[in-house]
Interface confidence: low
């Protein structure tokens, strides 16, 4: 710190402030009476440089003058751009302990003439704002820099203002506070800047502009929306403007959409008829003015107008779908399925759905409506029977959907080809078939179904299922389909009246599964062993199960086990082996196996045959 | 993923005193530039204080706060503090923490908010009787 230069004064020439690339002369000069005392003659003045308050250089050897004891110049080169202080102390060279001691200190700024402002934009924001301007002030001066903005109108009127940029604030921008009234649209106006710091000034080429190239109209407000009589794809959008506008562009999209609609309307006076609007769709709307039809600048748009339009009645057709299941010799329970429309289709929220169903030599027909997406009932086995389903929304209901109800798996002849299952990735599954060889009938389209070979899947969930039409081979299921878990997968073939079915086991991706079957018993019967098993839990058999293969071994022994594999069924839980010795102890367990390989063995469990009773 | 998380803000008396801190994570800012900046409603977001980075970590102030204010950091946790004294109401704004990739050595380029590159989400500073 340095205390108001009691001991004396420091001073620069030609000035403090100086262009980069000049010399400074710095003098520092002790005040009468001030110094080491006794022996003036010792005082030494030295000048310490200082960047940033760190000390960088002892100006020591720039002396160029010397009153020895009463002042001292030095001079300084090579500053750079900014601020750089120099501070003067007093070393009494008698007293080598003593540290110099302050005098007085000045700081040099070093920068460079403001350039001419250039790029100058003025802008007006609505019929009341304010003209505001900014300008692109060329290279940094490191110096505080004034900077006028003069503009010159009609009526010999001139209005200036100021601001300045210095190294904690920059000047490229000024609101005049004057505002410019449509009454002047036909007049020119004159602007320029001027710029001056110390080491110097310099002004802009003039900008000339008129009232239509400033304004910018504020975006219209209180947008609303009515649709003539309810209608869900017809609706007048109004808005409010400033009065002076002539030209409106209105832009709207679905808010799940990534384009907008453009339109543009003159003269629209705050009313535009929109006539292909989506039904019971969430629309953005926005809306930007212009003052002239050709000149000018456009609003920002508007704030958003979020709004649903009304519900129209439903033009989808039902995706539908059903499983048999007899009950007894006379009775069956038939489970219709059927998909939600989507929302283009439903254009409004679905209240219910209508389901009937009829014998078709309409001795019954079963009527019901439903809020779900499902439908069971108990009918005779006797009778050709058909069902038909439609979904009501406020508006209206979709025409109906008829299926023929027919034995799905019931025709052989029917039963597509070489199913296969192929996993295609982490999420879906492509199943591809060839068509019956013998079909008497012609195949009206196919249906892959699927659903996860879970416990109680079939009571628990709706089947999934894709239609494909009758010259396709292939499909690509992926709703619902999770990696590690496997999928039941039927390909039906359809006629006018029968159905035939090919059935495929398939994941989209598999493991090893994580454990084996769990022997939970060994019986022997007439020389052979039985092994019974529990089967792998679902979540741990991480894929489609091919085969089982039961490994054993003698107690004791180090030979590799022998083992027996059996094709994966589900519905077994039990398969004889008849190699074994008897009044031998065999060690036996299981393994699982999936494409991707076999599981950690399950448990072991010792059995020793008897062989023949005597 | 760098974070700067400022602390320490809060209401207080013309006069009173406040040691706002500033903890980085995401990576280590020892040898770079650090900087105190505060944003009053209505105004530019200005310097106020700042470090070098550079060896000797020089301590940069904004003239109007020289004497009151005071920056320092703990290299080892990663830390910078900013203990304001003598509080007055014109210090009252949002304080805000920033962090270059850089040393900066340039008084005209360390109070500049372009100098830096990441940003804490601010503390607020009120000083009122």
């Known amino acids: 710190n340095i205390d108001v230069c009691k001991l004396g004064t420091v001073t620069v020439q030609p000035a403090p402030v100086i262009p980069l690339g000049s010399a400074a002369n710095i003098s520092c000069s002790l005040n009468p009476k001030q110094g080491c005392s006794h022996y003036p003659s010792s005082n030494e003045l030295i000048l310490l440089k200082f960047v940033n308050d760190v000390l960088v250089e002892n100006l020591h050897g720039k002396k160029v003058h010397d009153h020895t004891g009463h002042s001292s110049t030095f001079q300084v080169t090579n500053l750079s751009l900014g601020m750089t202080l120099f501070v003067c102390k007093l070393n009494c060279s008698n007293s080598q302990k003593k540290p110099p001691v302050p005098v007085c200190g000045v700081e040099i700024s070093v920068g460079v003439a403001p350039e001419p402002p250039q790029n100058i934009s003025c802008v007006q924001e609505g019929e009341n704002g304010t003209v505001a301007c900014s300008w692109n002030s060329g290279k940094v001066t490191y110096l505080k820099t004034n900077y006028t903005l003069q503009l010159s109108g009609p009526n010999n009127l001139t209005c200036q203002k100021q601001c300045f940029s210095d190294n904690r604030q920059n000047c490229n921008r000024l609101d005049l506070g004057i505002n410019l009234s449509p009454d002047l649209a036909e007049s020119r106006f004159i602007v320029r800047v001027t710029a001056i710091n110390d080491l110097g000034n310099s002004s802009s080429l003039p900008h000339t502009f008129t009232f239509l190239d400033i304004v910018i109209p504020l975006p219209p407000w209180d947008i609303r929306i009515n649709f003539l009589n309810a209608s869900g794809s017809r609706g007048t959008l109004q808005w409010e403007d400033e009065g002076q506008v002539v030209l409106n562009q209105l832009r709207y999209q679905p808010l799940n959409s990534t384009s907008w609609n453009m339109v543009n309307a003159t003269n629209a006076k705050g009313k535009y008829d929109l006539r292909d609007l989506r039904p019971f769709t969430e629309y953005e709307f926005q809306i930007s003015s212009k003052l002239h039809l050709s000149g000018g600048s456009w609003s920002n748009w508007s704030e958003s107008l979020r709004t649903r339009t009304p519900e129209e009645e439903p033009v989808g057709i039902l995706d539908i779908w059903y499983m048999k299941q007899d009950i007894d010799y006379d009775r069956q329970q038939i489970s219709l399925f059927w998909k939600s429309l989507n929302p283009s289709e439903a254009r409004g929220k679905i209240l219910h759905y209508q389901v009937t169903l009829q014998e078709v030599t309409k001795k019954t027909t079963l009527q019901n409506t439903t809020r779900h997406t499902s439908w069971t009932r108990v009918i005779p086995r006797t009778g050709a029977w058909t069902a038909s389903v439609s979904a009501a929304n406020s508006k209206g209901a979709s025409a109906p959907t008829h299926i023929n109800i027919v034995d799905l798996c019931g025709t052989g002849l029917l039963a597509p080809h070489q199913v296969s299952a192929k996993s295609e990735n982490m999420d879906n599954i492509l199943v591809t078939w060839q068509p019956p060889k013998k079909a008497d009938s012609a195949v009206r389209e196919y249906i892959v179904e699927w659903r996860a070979l879970q416990p109680g899947s079939i009571t628990k969930f709706p089947p999934h299922w894709l239609r494909i039409p009758p010259d396709n081979m292939s499909a690509l299921i992926s709703e619902n389909i999770k990696p590690y878990i496997c999928y039941e997968i039927r390909v039906h073939a359809l006629s006018e009246s029968q159905g035939g079915c090919s059935s495929i086991r398939g994941d989209s991706k598999h493991k090893a599964p994580v454990s084996g079957p769990h022997i939970t018993a060994i019986t022997e019967k007439k020389e052979r062993l039985f092994i019974s098993w529990t089967h792998i839990p679902f979540p741990e058999q991480r894929g489609c199960i091919l085969h089982y293969r039961i490994y054993w071994k003698e107690r004791d022994s180090t030979a590799q086990p022998e083992l027996c594999e059996i094709q994966y069924r589900r519905s077994q839980n039990s398969h004889p082996i008849s190699s074994l010795q008897p009044r031998v102890t065999y060690v036996l367990w299981m393994t699982a196996v999936t494409a991707a390989g076999e599981s950690p063995q399950g448990n072991e469990r010792e059995f020793c045959p008897q062989g023949k009773a005597n | 993923q760098v974070q700067l998380q400022e602390s320490g803000g809060g209401l207080v008396q013309p006069g009173g005193s406040l040691r706002l801190s500033c903890a980085a994570s995401g990576r280590t800012f020892s040898n770079y530039a650090m900087a105190w900046f505060r944003q009053a409603p209505g105004t530019e977001r200005e310097f106020v204080a700042g470090?070098?980075?550079?060896?000797?970590?020089?301590?940069f102030y904004d003239n109007s706060v020289m004497g009151r204010f005071t920056i320092s950091r703990d290299s080892a946790k990663n830390t910078m503090w900013l203990q304001i004294n003598n509080l007055k109401p014109e210090d009252t704004a949002v304080y805000y923490c920033a962090a270059a990739t850089h040393v900066v050595v340039s008084y005209g380029l360390v109070r500049r908010r372009g100098t830096y590159d990441y940003w804490g989400q601010g503390t607020q500073v009120t000083v009122s009787s």
């Open positions: 470090l070098s980075g550079s060896g000797g970590d020089t301590a």
